[in-house]
């Protein structure tokens, strides 16, 4: 059926768009994880 073909060949739902994270500090260590702004 159309619905079955659509299910098989339709574009899959992708992952949510994720902004690249910003690492604003000049010197960072592993405890200072950066953050995704406005995420």
């Amino acid at each position: 059926s159309y619905s079955m073909e659509h299910f098989r060949w339709g574009k899959p739902v992708g992952k949510k768009r994720r902004p690249v994270k910003v690492y604003p500090n000049g010197a960072e260590d592993e405890s200072a994880e950066a953050f995704p702004l406005e995420f």
Epitope: G14, R17, E28
Partner: antibody, heavy 113, light 112 residues
Framework: EVQLVESGGGLVQPGGSLRLSCAAS????????MIWVRQAPGKGLESIGM???????YYASSAKGRFTISRDNSKNTLYLQMNSLRAEDTAVYYC???????WGQGTLVTVSS | DIQMTQSPSTLSASVGDRVTITCQAS??????LAWYQQKPGKAPKLLIY???TLASGVPSRFSGSGSGTEFTLTISSLQPDDFATYYC??????????????FGGGTKVEIK
Amino acid sequence: EVQLVESGGGLVQPGGSLRLSCAASGFTVSNYDMIWVRQAPGKGLESIGMIYDDGDTYYASSAKGRFTISRDNSKNTLYLQMNSLRAEDTAVYYCVKGVSNHWGQGTLVTVSS
Amino acid sequence: DIQMTQSPSTLSASVGDRVTITCQASQSISSYLAWYQQKPGKAPKLLIYSASTLASGVPSRFSGSGSGTEFTLTISSLQPDDFATYYCQSYDGSSGSSYGVGFGGGTKVEIK
């Protein structure tokens, strides 16, 4: 101190392949988003691909199907595998830690016969 | 892919001038925009992120504004050290076949 050091650039013939490395120190590559950026001589910056901290990779149209980004967590190193190279791929290639001041020094790739 | 259009490509100015550079995104990127400064032979330096937040150590004469598709970088009073090339960068991220990280073509600020 955060440091990124690219290597692997050089002269390659059109159609050839090259693998660039970006050795990181001062942080763990797998915990951060990383971007490859290139700059042709006298030209502007071009983002060619990225790898998210979770390992997902994405590519600009100019790189899709020819370039592959990977990382080796045990070596704390990021890679850019470049195949089917063209003259227009001639550029300085930088690895960058997300959006930040942490850029490598760049490695020059020259594609010429 | 996201397309970032920057203008002007070259700008002639004098020390003390107020300088404005604009950047337009081909689609809405919210406030996921950064500005970089690059000098010849050097890696770019981050000036502004999240469209308007100054990076650490950046002088307050630099400011950024905008959201969606229209963005502006302003230097309130140009200093000798500011003659360089400036790039905007979208970092809206990627999903599916859409690559959301892109740079504008650059604006070279030169001495008049």
